[in-house]
């Protein structure tokens, strides 16, 4: 699958999501990410599929990708740890942990986000926030400033309908509605936040954006608590 999938959203309040990261390849935005510890950013494994020869860095404290901002800082990556079971051709286990070259300088615009450890589905209909620098319309325009959208969680049974994702949504994945509002190309690896807690990570599977019959797919972080803890230890 490609590296990517906010459509129908709006510009985020600057620096109101201090956990938000831009995973960059050779100085350009590649994927979203989320600061989960002082020295660790969680993203999607597929994001690095094409990055073999390039320089991967993580931008923290940013609202605009291009404009100077006092809180912005680009960190080198000391270690990239994809989930051991992630594979190029599936959306399963699409998680990646990036260890920064040093601990991030924390402040109002840079702060880790608590992540869900209780392995229980988010109730369908719950409004969750997804943010990113992914494409914002059907033309494919890429924004300079962080965008966000509120999306209702969709129950797994509906998401698994033959007309939707046809059984591909395992218990380790969750879905959100995608009727005109959706995550899209370039949002992969970014956070799905419900009630101030990280619940999901945008997967980078091949998917049309903004089509209600192709809901957004998110990796449930609670299902991977043991792996995350083992890497961060």
């Amino acid at each position: 699958p490609p590296r990517g999938r906010i459509l129908g959203g709006r510009e985020a309040e600057a620096h109101a999501r201090p956990y938000m990261a831009s995973v960059q390849l050779n100085g350009a935005h590649l994927c979203g990410g989320v600061l989960v510890a002082e020295q660790w950013v969680l993203s999607a494994a597929h994001c690095l599929e094409d990055a073999a020869d390039g320089k991967v860095q993580v931008l923290l404290g940013a609202h605009s990708l291009s404009q100077p901002e006092p809180s912005k800082r680009l960190y080198d990556v000391l270690r990239a740890v994809p989930h051991p079971d992630s594979q190029p051709d599936t959306i399963d286990h699409d998680l990646l942990l990036l260890q920064l070259s040093e601990k991030a300088t924390l402040g109002p615009a840079v702060r880790p986000l608590p992540w869900q450890r209780v392995d229980r589905d988010v109730a369908p209909g719950t409004l969750c926030d997804v943010a990113g620098w992914g494409i914002v319309n059907h033309a494919g325009r890429r924004p300079d400033s962080l965008q966000h959208v509120l999306l209702p969680v969709l129950d797994r049974a509906t998401c698994n309908r033959r007309t939707h994702h046809d059984g591909a949504i395992t218990e380790r994945l969750m879905c959100a509605e995608s009727n005109r509002r959706d995550s899209c190309k370039g949002d992969s690896g970014g956070p799905l936040v419900c009630g101030g807690v990280l619940e999901g990570v945008v997967t980078s599977g091949s998917r049309v954006c903004g089509n209600r019959k192709k809901p957004g797919i998110y990796t449930r972080v609670a299902s991977y608590a043991a792996w995350i803890d083992s890497v961060l230890a």
Epitope: P1, P2, R3, G4, A28, D50, I135, V136, N137, H138, A139, G140, R141, R142, K185, G186, S206, R207, V208
Partner: antibody, heavy 113, light 106 residues
């Protein structure tokens, strides 16, 4: 610097097919959508369709379904437009564009026996 | 499909004059793109998402509107603005263009 370089003018016979290319530099076509637009002489613009080069997903205006096929080769950073069963109605300039923001110089297709 | 009707089809304006052209949609759309095309040139994106100026576009250009009614305004016409202007909707597939407004210099 972002650039889209399109292939040269084509003179083709009715009933034949033609494949136009659009090679991008300064950005990775995987990162956005690539579109093709048709313009007949002294006429307006018509959106043919688009491709997401990252996954090959395409959408077309129904009027071009069966006439146009859009593909992409990410290894060469190139998008393609194939036009089949050509008639005089297909004589036009064809533009490729990245996210409708950056445009190629256009390729002129003339269908004539 | 959504039909976009641009008016007027042809418009003449003197340098320094304010110019407004409209784009009317057959049903409500969320946002509009505007393009400028000069003879023997490729189209150029002027305005995206109804009112945002594309990179390098002079500030004399502005866009506005909502629902079914959109407009492009040039605050002070310059000779180099002589061109054909097209609107395009990105709300509903297929993503249709208007027929264009040809702007001439008086």
């Amino acid at each position: 610097e972002v650039q889209l370089q399109q292939s040269g003018a084509e003179l083709v016979k009715p009933g034949a097919s033609v494949k136009l290319s659009c090679t991008a530099s300064g950005f990775n076509i995987k990162d956005t959508y690539m579109h093709w637009v048709k313009q007949r002489p002294e006429q307006g613009l018509e959106w043919i369709g688009r491709i997401d080069p990252a996954n090959g997903y395409t959408e077309y205006d129904p009027k071009f379904q069966g006439k146009a096929t859009i593909t992409a080769d990410t290894s060469s950073n190139t998008a393609y437009l194939q036009l089949s069963s050509l008639t005089s109605e297909d004589s036009a300039a064809y533009y490729c564009t990245s996210a409708m923001e950056f445009w190629g110089q256009g390729t002129s297709v003339t269908v004539s026996s | 499909q959504i039909v976009l009707t641009q008016s007027p089809a042809i418009l003449s304006a003197s340098p320094g004059e304010k110019v407004t052209m409209t784009c009317s949609a057959s049903s409500s759309v969320s946002y509009i793109y505007w393009y400028q095309q000069k003879p023997r040139s490729s189209p150029r994106l002027l305005i995206y998402d109804t009112s945002n100026l594309a990179s390098g576009v002079p500030v004399r250009f502005s866009g506005s509107g909502s629902g079914t009614s959109y407009s492009l305004t040039i605050s002070r016409m310059e000779a180099e603005d002589a061109a054909t202007y097209y609107c395009q909707q990105w709300s509903s597939y297929p993503f249709t263009f208007g027929g264009g407004t040809k702007l001439e210099v008086k």
